[in-house]
């Protein structure tokens, strides 16, 4: 089982849309795949895929999940808010026929505020 996640870095404006993609590949067929998205280590959602369908379509606040055969799991955040900023990781595990798991690399999402003054304040708040 292998998981490739993208993009590595995503910078979007508040109120727009962010799309994170996870490609899940397995050399043999699988009956049930457990998938998980985390943000800064906290679980956003943990549905499974069987018979070509996701058990859940919602993933965290304003998050929509979709599965496009053969291998693409997409997390769409719309509209994006400032607190969507963070480090996202996609994880997958074949549960049937036998357990095998893998995870992607981090996608860092940066959300720029609509108000330029908020942006100045946010930058000023970083140390150094």
């Amino acid at each position: 089982l292998s998981v490739q996640q993208g993009p590595n870095l995503l910078q979007v404006r508040q109120g727009s849309q962010a799309t994170l993609v996870c490609q899940v590949d397995q050399a043999t067929a699988w009956e049930r795949l457990r998938v998980k998205w985390t943000k800064d280590g906290a679980i956003l959602c943990q549905p499974y895929i069987t018979n070509g369908s996701l058990s859940l379509g919602v993933c965290g606040p304003q998050g929509r999940l979709s599965w496009q055969a053969p291998s693409h799991l997409t997390l769409q955040l719309d509209p994006v808010s400032l607190n969507h900023s963070g480090a996202y990781v996609c994880w997958a595990a074949v549960e049937i026929p036998e357990l095998e798991e893998a995870e992607g690399n981090i996608t860092r999402l940066f959300v720029d505020p609509d108000d330029p003054t908020q942006n100045r304040n946010r930058i000023a708040s970083f140390p150094g």
Epitope: L1, S2, Q23, D25, Q26, A27, T28, A29, W30, E31, L33, I49, T50, N51, G52, A69, P70, S71, P97, E100, A102
Partner: antibody, heavy 120, light 113 residues
Framework: QVQLQESGPGLVKPAQTLSLTCTVS??????????WSWIRQYPGKRLEWIGY???????SYNPSLKSRVTISRDTSKNQFSLKLTSVTAADTATYCC????????????WGQGTMVTVSS | DIVMTQSPDSLAVSLGERATINCKSS????????????LNWYQQKPGQSPKLLIY???TRLSGVPDRFSGSGSGTDFTLTISSLQAEDVADYYC?????????FGDGTKLEIK
Amino acid sequence: QVQLQESGPGLVKPAQTLSLTCTVSGFSISTSGYYWSWIRQYPGKRLEWIGYINYGGGTSYNPSLKSRVTISRDTSKNQFSLKLTSVTAADTATYCCATMADRFAFFDVWGQGTMVTVSS
Amino acid sequence: DIVMTQSPDSLAVSLGERATINCKSSQSLFSSNTNRNYLNWYQQKPGQSPKLLIYHASTRLSGVPDRFSGSGSGTDFTLTISSLQAEDVADYYCQHHYETPLTFGDGTKLEIK
């Protein structure tokens, strides 16, 4: 590009252990998503998958051989090996190593094969 | 284990004519999760290792001549050579990767009539 080369004795006595090594060049056997297999082809041309070792060191074996087979690897030498115990004349075949990936699940690169005869 | 049954065992076709090789699996090789058939076709010439022609039942590997095509779904698959060339003389094998153990068909020997 990736190349695979089998090595080992061409003649093994019945009841002994067949040991072969596959040396991989141009690619790391630890690369995520790749599987390293042993396949044998009998004199009558039939192909049989023996088993694989994956990028993390996990193995899967053909149940028909599971009690006799071990596939291991040496990442420092970029090699993986086959051991088949208690061989008989029925194990006489050309043994090939091959690789496949999760993303494209076919044997895309093969060694040239080494003929192993089991005979006293 | 999934049993792969190829037919015919051997086939003689005239140059420029169509060659058809069949492969039947003992259970379906289609997955609704991925919309894929887990079936490959290989060509093996004398003294050489097998070479992949077709994967996922119908996807031709880059560099393989377009006279080679694969079709079928579920349990019944076909490899077609639309216009036989002299260099196509070889043994042809189907192979599934739906589950382990991976198994091959017994092969079809293709010759020129």
